[in-house]
């Protein structure tokens, strides 16, 4: 039978999405116990029938990976969780509409920072996602977001930063002092979706100038 308040058993049912990996998470309510079991269903916008997610039926953990099931970038999805307590009480709660394009957050980019004597080179590596193209190959963030660009900053001292940005993958900050430590930060930006990744940070030191030794 249904509890007086579903929140007694189940709370905060939501998608947590990063780089298009879409994980459904939830919390137990104040009357939830370790032996409460959870079953997950999902569906797309306007569809009548909920689909049971295999591998996420009568589980005790509080997360379920729905990345494969929610892989259409233009689709809207819902998921819902039904909690059943050891005493047979049940509660069901559903997520808000979920759009991976809209809701996914961006992880810091994968960057290689290379020290030189008077410059620092930064090479941004393409970010793979679980999204597959029609031919089966995995799309990168750059494939998905056509207006994606990188914003790079090099902290020279407390009052001075150098900035670079663009769509290319290789950048170089020139005119630096040899044998000096710098802090680089690199972010992914997607203006049309108002997305900005957390920064990748590298602390690098220019090489000493051996020409004077």
């Amino acid at each position: 039978h249904a509890p007086e308040d579903p929140s007694d058993l189940l709370q905060h049912v939501k998608f947590q999405s990063s780089n298009f990996e879409n994980i459904l998470t939830w919390d137990s309510g104040p009357e939830g116990t370790p032996d409460t079991v959870y079953s997950i269903e999902y569906k797309t916008y306007g569809e009548r029938d909920w689909v049971a997610k295999k591998g996420c039926q009568r589980i005790t953990r509080k997360s379920c990976n729905l990345t494969v099931e929610t892989g259409n970038l233009t689709e809207l999805y819902y998921a819902r969780v039904t909690a059943v307590s050891a005493g047979g009480r049940s509660a069901t709660k559903m997520t808000d509409r979920f759009s991976s394009l809209q809701h996914t957050t961006l992880k810091p980019p994968d960057v290689t920072c290379i020290s030189k004597v008077r410059s620092i080179q930064m090479i941004v590596h393409p970010t793979p996602t679980p999204i597959r193209a029609g031919d089966g190959h995995r799309l990168t963030l750059e494939d998905i977001f056509h207006d994606l660009f990188y914003h790079l900053e090099l902290q020279v001292n407390r009052t001075y930063q150098m900035h670079l940005g663009g769509k290319q993958r290789e950048y170089e900050f020139f005119g630096l002092t040899p044998d000096t430590e710098f802090l680089g930060t690199i972010m992914i930006c997607v203006p049309t979706w108002a997305k900005e990744s957390a920064p990748y940070m590298c602390r690098v030191k220019t090489l000493p100038d051996r020409t004077w030794t």
Epitope: V13, Y45, G46, Y78, R80, K93, M94
Partner: antibody
Framework: EVQLVESGGGLVQPGGSLRLSCAAS????????MNWVRQAPGKGLEWIGE????????TYNQKFKGRFTISVDQSKNTAYLQMNSLRAEDTAVYYC?????????WGQGTLVTVSS | DIVMTQSPDSLAVSLGERATINCKSS????????????LAWYQQKPGQPPKLLIY???SRESGVPDRFSGSGSGTDFTLTISSLQAEDVAVYYC?????????FGQGTKVEIK
Amino acid sequence: EVQLVESGGGLVQPGGSLRLSCAASGYSITAEYMNWVRQAPGKGLEWIGEINPSTGTTTYNQKFKGRFTISVDQSKNTAYLQMNSLRAEDTAVYYCARFDAYFDYWGQGTLVTVSS
Amino acid sequence: DIVMTQSPDSLAVSLGERATINCKSSQSLLYSSNQKNCLAWYQQKPGQPPKLLIYWASSRESGVPDRFSGSGSGTDFTLTISSLQAEDVAVYYCQQYYSYPFTFGQGTKVEIK
């Protein structure tokens, strides 16, 4: 069997307020979206807005935003429509209707008459 | 807002004959994700709430007689009652769920000739 029962309608003066209720039975209200739709006498249907009863997230027809508020009491398996600053043109039958796109179950409706 | 326009406003058809109601939207209702159209049809009898007949423009709701069918795509849609029965006398509404706010047509009244 899914059932939706509206209540709370009646006669109210212009400028007044009214809260309509929609009691759901036969399913958990948190399992599907809930909408409010109204129909003026002899007229067509007008969508007011929706709520996700699990999260409380609402979307309104801009026409009603600010005056009408949709909410849910999960423990009572009931949705509400709070209507403020009522006008004569708000006279209508108010329905609650289930689902997130089109509407598969409707209540019988409750009549709201705004008149002095 | 998407404007839904139904025609005709009223329709008189003999028992057993075909009734056709049209619905036109002010923009396309084709949903790119599934290539279906975000359009539903409802039947409303006097003193009753609307009843869902058709969704996704052509999917018949469970329990709805197969004399009711929906067709069309993009901006032009049709509800057909293949053989009108006495119990089909009602007002019929189309509704779009492509974008907020969801909007309805003004309704078409179907009567017996």
